[in-house]
């Protein structure tokens, strides 16, 4: 099954939303409306 | 100016499809996740779902998971968002999201 | 689903008075990393939202320090300590321990 990472730091394995501590992705843009960085 | 831009209002019949554009301006849309949500008349906000444009993986909210599709091409710099099967439920105002920017809003009416 | 449920749904103010709204989860947004995952918007009329508060009380860039959020693990406070002409609107909570889930939204007008 595919793997996804997820805002707050989930990752999905079957369809199961896993937590894990470290803000996973955060500095993609994983908060609505959260400027990210400068302007790319 | 950096935005968000999306495309124009659109009025679909039921069981019809819509696809929702959002295109960076001075803003590269690829290099962070894009967010969609839609706001019904006079409603709250909910969530669609996202997608890493690196890399095409989304995620979405159960409700929506076979209402929505979206897809990013990076040679554009454009998001979209399809909607299939519309019903007048699906009436609402929808938001792309990327980083700090919001888009304007597309308003799409289902009605017969 | 997480629920997320605010009072007063609506919340008529006085230009330099203190105003708060309040949000409850129907379940902890406190995770054991210690980061609580409750965020406040704001959609001023005609606008797109916009994001004022993140992971319960760190201030997103450009919000006045008017603004201030507390809470719980359920419970939470969005605190404007002198109201702004500007700060009309409507204010939602969300979260994002599981997915994003929004409260119905509070409208602050101007008495």
């Known amino acids: 099954d595919a793997e996804f990472r997820h805002d707050s730091g989930y990752e999905v394995h079957h369809q199961k939303l896993v937590f894990f501590a470290e803000d996973v992705g955060s500095n993609k843009g994983a908060i609505i409306g959260l400027m990210v960085g400068g302007v790319v | 100016q950096v935005q968000l831009v999306q495309s124009g209002a659109e009025v679909k019949e039921p069981g019809a499809s819509v696809k929702v554009s959002c295109t960076g301006s001075g803003f590269n849309i690829h290099v962070y996740y894009v967010h969609w949500l839609r706001q019904l008349p006079e409603k709250g906000l909910e969530w669609i779902g996202r997608i890493d444009p690196e890399n095409g993986e989304t995620i979405y909210t159960p409700k929506f998971q076979d209402k929505a599709t979206l897809t990013v091409d990076t040679s554009t710099d454009t998001a979209y968002m399809e909607l299939s099967s519309l019903r007048s439920e699906d009436t609402a105002v929808y938001y792309c999201?990327?980083?700090?920017?919001w888009g304007q809003g597309t308003l799409v009416t289902v009605s017969s | 689903d997480i629920v997320m449920t605010q009072s007063p749904l609506s919340n008529p103010v006085t230009p330099g008075e203190p105003a708060s709204i309040s949000c409850r989860s129907s379940?902890?947004?406190?995770?054991?990393?210690?980061?609580?995952?409750l965020y406040w918007y704001l959609q001023k009329p005609g606008q797109s939202p916009q994001l004022l508060i993140y992971?319960?009380?760190h201030l997103a860039s450009g919000v006045p320090d008017r603004f201030s959020s507390s809470g719980s693990g359920t419970d939470f406070t969005l605190k404007i300590s002198r109201v702004e002409a500007e700060d009309v609107g409507v204010y939602y909570c969300a979260q994002n321990l599981e997915l994003w889930t929004f409260g119905q939204g509070t409208k602050v007008e101007i008495k």
């Open positions: 992971q319960m009380d």
């Open positions: 999201v990327s980083s700090g920017y």
């Open positions: 379940k902890s947004l406190l995770h054991r990393n210690g980061k609580t995952y």
